[in-house]
């Protein structure tokens, strides 16, 4: 820092209060309005213009530097002159029904150009035709039900699956493995139409012509499909598209429930195996294969003409240099690209980030600096597979793994307006609990009460009484590369729906053209008080992480969850007591490692309490132990067949990218083990994974010991 630049020595708590008080709901509302006037699809000129606008505004807000980081990555777009659709054809090949080519535009947006029609990004081209099989949610267990129980072979069939429960890419992967030649994805009213609520524009429900867009990749953390492991810069070696990571091999297309009705009402074959296969349409939900009665000679045909194209994307990276530890980075990042207007996803998050930057900038202009450096990121191409964040992290991996303290994600601020939802590393549990005790609840009936109180009442932890639920990190968002690949402590927070009374997975209008500013302003958060609360939580976490003298991480909380996860995986294994005996499978090493970790974490905390915080070297040593603890759970070899998922305690579920799985290596080795052809080999892999987990926990414990 230049000598002329002042640094006000103001008590930290006062600065935190100043930072939080500076955050304004009205500003978030204004920013959201500004960000949602037009579509901002990744790789388009409009999204580049928005990147430059954000760069300019962050500079005005007072950040030290704001740069654009560009990459040339594989994206996917529909063919403008050759639209994608699905048809029912008769025995002569005549198209007797065609699905719609676009969503009816919402009021006020009829003349907006470049609204991308519904499509599943990265679908290959193709025009398959065949009999239809209804596969429910296309979960692993749904295909098990069809193949093993109903004895239905999906080979050579087109499957129709309803959106929900799991990431759409997993649905496509499951369909491919089952031998399907095409996939139709649709939004069922049972999942995307809440009872008693009107369709948009009169309410927040999905109309019959609404369709969810989304990518169908299975990247497993690779980033750009052509440059796995390395940034997609100008000198990058690019794979041939035939060798690209994670691309689907069969055509896939999404439709709304009006069009789905036309297909499903004709279905014959077997009745749905049980009530969990029935949705909300007035159709029998027969699984097929094929149509019934007068339609029995008709087939389904897909017409997919999308193109994959290497396209330039732009991240915006802003820096607020730390006054004391400029080489320690706290990152707040969220994406900017949207499928259409992005009313919720992502701009409700981007507007919050914008206001957080403005508040930090205001403090900086008054002479304050954070202790540690704060990096702010507006990621591009998240919707195409977390590409912007992953490419940037690949480019900066060496620095990040040495200097990265924490990453706080900032996608959609709301998916409902019921209560807070937090997913984070156990290291952040105490940070989140302490922060929410200091913040006001925005909820009706909780006036004058803390956010912690309303959150705890509405979403109590299933394990720890008196504490709110905090979930495991999975994936499907931009924290993935930071947490799962690099081992940087990460967290995310947003306002959510009541999961007990609402069974739909995402909000009904997710990734549709109806995700507009008006959706938020009219139905979800008219006063923007929930957005403000999310800004306070995200901003407050960043503030504490960047400004606390001792990092606000509690390693004892990791010890508690490690024991819980070890118990859970042991119980799964114990469903096979005979095999465990036959193959001498023991979890003793893992339980011993967890016990050791628990004891060492406890001793570490005792030393931390006695630490002379005025000794910068001793302080830095212990802070580094806390910072590097998450890193210690990284295995450089990665998980089997998933080299970019390297965290041994957590990984995205192999069956649902959105969900987190604990001890994923052991879990996957045990999954469906009773069906394995070679049980000796299968149980050998279980033993190998137990040993890896035990070693990793022991090694992580070792990093918390006194350094000498």
């Amino acid at each position: 820092k230049s000598p002329s630049e002042p640094t006000n020595i103001v008590p930290q708590h006062d600065m935190k209060k100043a930072f939080l008080d500076e955050l304004k709901a009205e500003n978030i509302k204004r920013f959201l309005y500004n960000f949602t006037r037009l579509p901002h699809l990744a790789g388009t000129e409009r999204n580049f213009q928005l990147a430059k606008q954000i760069q300019s505004q962050w500079k005005e807000f007072g950040l030290d530097s704001v740069e654009l980081a560009h990459y040339d990555v594989l994206l996917s777009y529909p063919n403008k002159t050759h639209p994608n659709y699905i048809s029912i054809i008769d025995e002569d090949g005549n198209e007797i029904f065609n699905s719609s080519l676009f969503e009816p535009p919402p009021p006020g947006y009829e003349n907006v150009s470049d609204v991308v029609p519904p499509f599943n990004a990265f679908s290959p081209q193709g025009m398959p035709e065949g009999d239809l099989v209804y596969v429910n949610y296309a979960q692993t267990e749904d295909f098990f039900k069809l193949e093993r129980d109903l004895k239905i072979n999906c080979s050579g069939k087109i499957v129709i699956a309803r959106y929900g429960k799991i990431f759409r890419g997993n649905k496509v992967k499951n369909a491919q493995l089952a031998g399907a030649k095409g996939v139709i994805l649709y939004s069922d009213p049972a999942d995307y139409f809440a009872p008693g609520v009107k369709s948009y524009p009169d309410g927040w429900n999905l109309p019959g012509g609404g369709v969810q867009r989304g990518n169908i990749l299975n990247l497993n953390g690779a980033g750009d499909p052509l440059t796995p492991g390395y940034p997609a810069n100008e000198y990058a070696y690019r794979r041939e598209v035939t060798e690209a990571v994670g691309l689907p091999s069969i055509p896939v297309h999404p439709i709304g429930y009006n069009d789905a009705q036309k297909l499903l009402e004709k279905m014959g074959g077997a009745a749905p195996p049980d009530s969990s296969w029935r949705g909300g349409l007035q159709v029998p939900y027969n699984v097929g294969p094929g149509f019934t009665g007068n339609s029995s000679t008709q087939k389904v045909k897909m017409h997919i003409h999308s193109n994959n194209k290497v396209t330039r994307i732009y991240n915006v990276i802003g820096t607020l240099r730390g006054a004391v530890e400029p080489d320690r980075y706290v990152i707040l990042g969220g994406h900017r690209d949207s499928w259409v207007f992005g009313g919720i996803d992502p701009q409700s998050g981007a507007a919050v980030v914008h206001e957080i930057v403005r508040s930090f900038g205001t403090l900086k202009k008054e002479g304050w600096r954070p202790r540690r450096t704060i990096l702010f990121a507006s990621w591009d191409a998240e919707e195409f597979g977390l590409l912007g964040s992953t490419e940037w992290a690949e480019e900066n991996s060496r620095v990040l793994q040495e200097r990265g303290v924490a990453y706080i994600n900032a996608d959609s601020s709301i998916e409902g307006n019921y209560t807070l939802r937090v997913d984070c590393t156990p290291l952040m549990y105490s940070l989140v609990y302490n922060l929410t005790k200091e913040l006001q609840s925005p909820d009706e009936g909780f006036e004058g009460k803390s956010l912690y109180e309303s959150w705890n009442e509405k979403s109590p932890s299933p394990e720890f009484s008196g504490m709110p639920r905090i979930s495991k990190l999975g994936s499907g968002n931009d924290f993935e590369v930071f947490f799962q690949r690099l081992g940087i402590s990460s967290g995310r927070a947003r306002y959510t729906k009541n999961w007990e009374t609402s069974k739909f997975r995402s909000y009904p209008l997710y990734h549709s053209v109806y995700e507009t500013y008006e959706l938020v302003e009219k139905f979800y958060d008219p006063t923007f008080k929930y957005h403000l609360t999310v800004a306070q939580v995200r901003g407050g976490m960043v503030f504490e992480l960047a400004n606390s003298i001792v990092l606000p991480f509690d390693c004892r909380d990791y010890a508690v969850v490690l024991r819980k996860y070890a118990d859970k995986i042991y119980n799964i294994s114990m469903k096979h007591p005979q095999e465990m005996k036959t193959y001498s499978v023991s979890f003793d090493s893992l339980f011993s490692a967890v016990k050791n970790f628990t004891e060492i974490a406890s001793k570490f905390n005792e030393r931390l309490e006695d630490l002379d915080k005025k000794n910068p070297i001793l302080l830095r040593i212990m802070n580094d132990q806390l910072m590097f603890l998450e890193r210690a759970f990284i295995d450089p070899l990665g998980l089997p067949d998933r080299p970019f998922y390297r965290h041994i305690i957590y990984a995205p579920s192999s069956h649902n990218k959105y969900a987190g799985e604990s001890f994923p290596g052991i879990y996957d080795a045990l999954f469906d083990i009773e069906s394995k052809v070679d049980p000796s080999k299968a149980w050998g892999e279980v033993k190998r994974q137990i040993s890896i987990a035990a070693f990793t926990v022991q090694a992580a414990a070792g990093t918390l010991r006194e350094v000498a």
Epitope: D149, G268, A270, P273, S275, W277, T292
Partner: antibody, heavy 115, light 107 residues
């Protein structure tokens, strides 16, 4: 090998309830639909309902709706069928059958309803 | 409800005979139909599923055919252990229903 072992014969009074159990072994219990079927003396087989042991999803025959409840205990690999408000015409042999195509059957449980 | 009607209801035949049992559905069930064999005092056993696929362990003298509303079970050469009652059953729509049965007796 697959085995379904049902609980023993029951004699019940009209208006009472009966709960028949079906213990499965030799296969992955959660993978196969469990049906319940009954057969009155000299009559055809009559389907009552089914359950997906993995998620507890059930479907009941309209004829028995409100009177029959099918449940499972996954940890014990056991399915249960409870029939309430018994009447004399409910006297029958009750079978559990595993698999969508009724691949494997229990030995049957005779339920006699008599005052 | 879909009605299944089997014919004949009774059938007398001799060892070595070829016999055919028919099952008619009151509406189109595609190929969602199974055949079972039941002996007195015993539980039924699955013979054929999806109208024509032989269940594992079932002798190849049993075969099934048909789709829509007309189905047949054929035993190519009767063996002494085949004398029993045979049922068809549809799973195209709820409630799942069985035919009334065909009792195959020794002539």
């Amino acid at each position: 090998q697959v085995q379904l072992v049902q609980s023993g014969a029951e004699v019940k009074k009209p208006g009472a309830s009966v709960k028949v159990s079906c213990k499965a072994s030799g296969y992955t219990f959660t993978e196969y639909t469990m049906h319940w079927v009954r057969q009155a003396p000299g009559q055809r087989l009559e389907w009552m309902g089914n359950i997906n042991p993995n998620n507890g999803g059930t479907t009941y025959s309209q004829k028995f709706q409100g009177r029959v409840t099918i449940t499972v205990d996954k940890s014990a690999s056991t399915a249960y069928m409870e029939l309430s408000s018994l009447r004399s015409e409910d006297t029958a042999v009750y079978y559990c059958a595993a698999g969508w195509n009724f691949d494997y059957w229990g030995q049957g449980t005779l339920v006699t309803v008599s005052s | 409800d879909i009605q299944l009607t089997q014919s004949p209801s009774f059938l007398s035949a001799s060892v070595g005979d070829r016999v055919t049992i028919t099952c008619r559905a009151s509406q189109d069930v595609g190929t969602a139909l199974d055949w079972y064999q039941q002996k007195p005092g015993k539980a039924p056993k699955l013979l054929i599923y999806w109208a024509s696929t032989l269940h594992s362990g079932v002798p190849s003298r049993f075969s099934g055919s048909g789709s829509g509303t007309e189905f047949t079970l054929t035993i190519s050469s009767l063996q002494p252990e085949d004398f029993a009652t045979y049922y068809c059953q549809q799973y195209n729509s709820y409630p799942l229903t069985f035919g009334q049965g065909t009792k195959l007796e020794i002539k």
